[in-house]
């Protein structure tokens, strides 16, 4: 099949001590080979601070995964979402103030 | 082969602006951050502030918050340092570097030297 | 701002001879942030070793990187010429980022 750009939706949820959980959301993408990893200043975190989904097909010939970290609160427009796929890429903010999500089709 | 290409050195007067240009190659553009230091004559690095070429965010050390303004041209693949109210104590060589995958400055400019003086 | 002090200022030693840089922070940090540089006389720094230990593409095994928490440490196992220059250690855990004030590893 031809190449289908993920839609990226990151959202961020409390939790507690000062700290949030932010998740990068991509799906409806396809091929299923897709990078995602949570940025702090553009430097990818390391593997053991971030939790990943599998890449799971989402019922429409394409798919979905997901990946997540904590970060302090306050520090939000520190980190980004890095995607590649296909040859695109692209990085995706945290949401600030009372946003908490924000998607992104990749064209 | 990444590299990062500078501009030419300048000499500035006290109260001026000064801008800097960075051309990076080698990947794309957009992909990674672009760091600003500076390092005055013998002295140590001072970071000013990184911009994400994709999205345009900008962080900027507070100090130099008020004075400083990075940019990015999409378009030509170049990122730019501006600094305003310019004193003889920026005399500075201006380095820009590339955010890495596991450090924030994997690749260097060659620098551009900043003299300010009247 | 996380102050990171390194020492001593200079160090002084002959080729062969074994090179131990500190880098002592005024907060810990993780070790995923601390990294290290080498800047030669009229150049552009280098990295040298990123998040304490891991050695950065094409860095002679000569060079090593180890610590933790608050107390960072640079090794070069036995000194080549081309060894010797400033190098500065960079955290970047907190903002602003910050970097050390250098070591000058000199020919004695």
């Known amino acids: 099949g031809s190449t289908v750009p993920p839609m990226v939706n990151v959202t961020c949820s409390e939790v507690s001590e000062g700290n949030i959980t932010v998740t990068c959301r991509a799906s409806s993408f396809y091929p299923r080979n897709i990078t995602l990893t949570w940025r702090q200043d553009g430097v990818s975190l390391s593997h053991n601070t971030q939790q990943w989904g599998d890449v799971l097909p989402d019922g429409n010939g394409t798919y979905q995964t997901w990946v997540a970290t904590r970060i302090r609160q306050g520090e939000e427009q520190r980190f980004t979402c890095y995607m590649e796929h296909s040859g695109n890429h692209g990085t995706h903010p945290v949401p600030s103030g009372n946003s908490h999500h924000h998607h992104h089709h990749h064209h | 082969e990444i590299q990062l290409v500078q501009s030419g050195a300048e000499v500035k007067k006290p109260g001026a602006s000064v801008k800097v240009s960075c051309k990076p190659s080698g990947y794309a553009f957009t992909s990674n951050n672009i760091y600003w230091v500076r390092q005055a004559p013998g002295q140590g690095l001072e970071w000013i502030g990184y911009i994400d070429p994709y999205i345009g965010r900008i962080i900027y050390n507070q100090q130099f918050k008020d004075r400083a303004t990075l940019t990015v041209d999409k378009s030509t693949s170049t990122a730019y340092l501006e600094l305003s109210s310019l004193r003889s104590e920026d005399t500075a060589v201006y380095y820009c570097s590339r955010s890495g995958e596991r450090s924030n400055f994997d690749y260097w400019g060659q620098g551009t030297l900043v003299t300010v003086s009247s | 701002e996380i102050v990171l002090t390194q020492s001593p200022a200079t160090l002084s030693l002959s080729p062969g001879e074994r090179a131990t840089l500190s880098c002592s922070a005024s907060?810990?940090?993780?070790?995923?942030?601390l990294h290290w540089y080498q800047q030669k006389p009229g150049q552009s720094p280098r990295l040298l070793i990123y998040r304490t230990s891991n050695l950065a593409s094409g860095v002679p095994a000569r060079f090593s990187g180890s610590g933790s928490g608050t107390d960072y440490t640079l090794t070069i196992s036995s000194l080549e010429p081309e060894d010797f220059a400033v190098y500065y250690c960079?955290?970047?855990?907190?903002?602003?980022?910050?970097f050390g004030q250098g070591t000058k590893v000199e020919i004695k």
């Open positions: 907060s810990s940090i993780s070790s995923n942030y």
């Open positions: 960079q955290q970047g855990g907190s903002l602003p980022l910050t």
